[in-house]
Amino acid sequence: CDLPQTHSLGSRRTLMLLAQMRRISLFSCLKDRHDFGFPQEEFGNQFQKAETIPVLHEMIQQIFNLFSTKDSSAAWDETLLDKFYTELYQQLNDLEACVIQGVGVTETPLMKEDSILAVRKYFQRITLYLKEKKYSPCAWEVVRAEIMRSFSLSTNLQESLRSKE
């Protein structure tokens, strides 16, 4: 399955929207930074495309879930959020089309399940952090910057998968 060029452009647009969503500078929140333990190894180059697509799908689905809560709606600009949802939704569709075509279904299911679980736990840590920080502006900025960082890492993986073919 070849992810369309529009998927790559969508990833870049998503990063741009994440950047535009910033309301305060992380510099004002140095003490609020937190190591969420992004499972970078689950996005490592050792995977074949078949193994990465479900993990990437899970990553984007979890980002969607995180930013579509009531607390998120209160924290961010509504217009930017709507555009953000649209981009994420399109990427989910692109990835689902690949899964439907059979890519990522048959090979090493256990490895994928472990990877998907690692991504879910990562987002659970982020959700818990936000709760503990009472969804403060600094907490949301830390999370926005972390998602931007982890999303750009997973986007780099998508690009490397494309270039390997």
């Epitope: 535009q20 305060i24 510099f27 930074r33 190591d35 931007m148 960082r149």
Partner: antibody, heavy 122, light 107 residues
Framework: EVQLLESGGGLVQPGGSLRLSCAAS????????MHWVRQAPGKGLEWVSA???????YYADSVKGRFTISRDDSKNTLYLQMNSLKTEDTAVYYC????????????????WGQGTLVTVSS | DIQMTQSPSSLSASVGDRVTITCRAS??????LNWYQQRPGKAPKLLIY???RLQTGVPSRFSGSGSGTDFTLTISSLQPEDFATYYC?????????FGQGTKLEIK
């Protein structure tokens, strides 16, 4: 391309004043904290001052009360007003920021200007 | 203020050598530690952030490690362009502070 370009350096007498400017381009200037870092001739790097995106200001003890950092987001420009200059303020002054996604999160200073030389001498 | 202490202050090595520079913080800074390279007459360049993450475009022969108070920068196989001065810097709290630098010279 992300760029920072300093200007305003020069020779000034002890007790004098100087205003440095830094013109930014290639990124959303208003969203980022900006810093001044200096380097005396043949010496190491010293963080001088910073201003947050919201305008909060921070200073090293060595310049507190003498230097004032400010920004004009409409002009994409950072300033450093230096008063009561001392000979020990002689240095190359760099305008710096953290812009890349990873560097921003960890506040690694990934964008530097070319520097402007300030010489305080009688 | 957090003090950053680098060692050695200068180091002579040859092309192809493996080189390690250390940096110690006066208090726990977790992994908020960055490494810079500065060539004569040039602005510093970010090599590594978050103690071990390679900045985009930096060759993989550079690596960083450590957390808490003790950190290292390693160059696995020195290249001619690596002879420069290296600085560590903490970004845990304001004021940001730098190590005094390590000058890497050709033997």
């Amino acid at each position: 391309e992300v760029q920072l370009l300093e200007s305003g350096g020069g020779l000034v007498q002890p007790g004098g004043s100087l205003r440095l400017s830094c013109a930014a381009s290639g990124f959303t200037f208003s969203s980022y904290a900006m810093h001044w870092v200096r380097q005396a001739p043949g010496k190491g790097l010293e963080w001088v001052s910073a201003i947050g995106a919201g305008g909060g200001t921070y200073y090293a003890d060595s310049v507190k009360g003498r230097f004032t950092i400010s920004r004009d987001d409409s002009k994409n420009t950072l300033y450093l007003q230096m008063n009561s200059l001392k000979t020990e303020d002689t240095a190359v002054y760099y305008c710096v920021s953290s812009v890349g996604a990873g560097a921003y999160y960890y506040q690694g200073l990934d964008v530097w200007g070319q520097g402007t030389l300030v010489t305080v001498s009688s | 203020d957090i003090q950053m202490t680098q060692s050695p202050s200068s180091l002579s090595a040859s092309v192809g050598d493996r080189v390690t520079i250390t940096c110690r913080a006066s208090q726990d800074i977790f992994t908020y530690l960055n490494w810079y390279q500065q060539r004569p007459g040039k602005a510093p360049k970010l090599l590594i952030y978050d103690a071990s993450r390679l900045q985009t475009g930096v060759p993989s022969r550079f690596s960083g490690s450590g957390s808490g108070t003790d950190f290292t920068l390693t160059i696995s196989s020195l290249q001619p362009e690596d002879f420069a001065t290296y600085y560590c810097q903490q970004s845990y709290s304001i004021p940001y502070t730098f190590g005094q630098g390590t000058k890497l010279e050709i033997k």
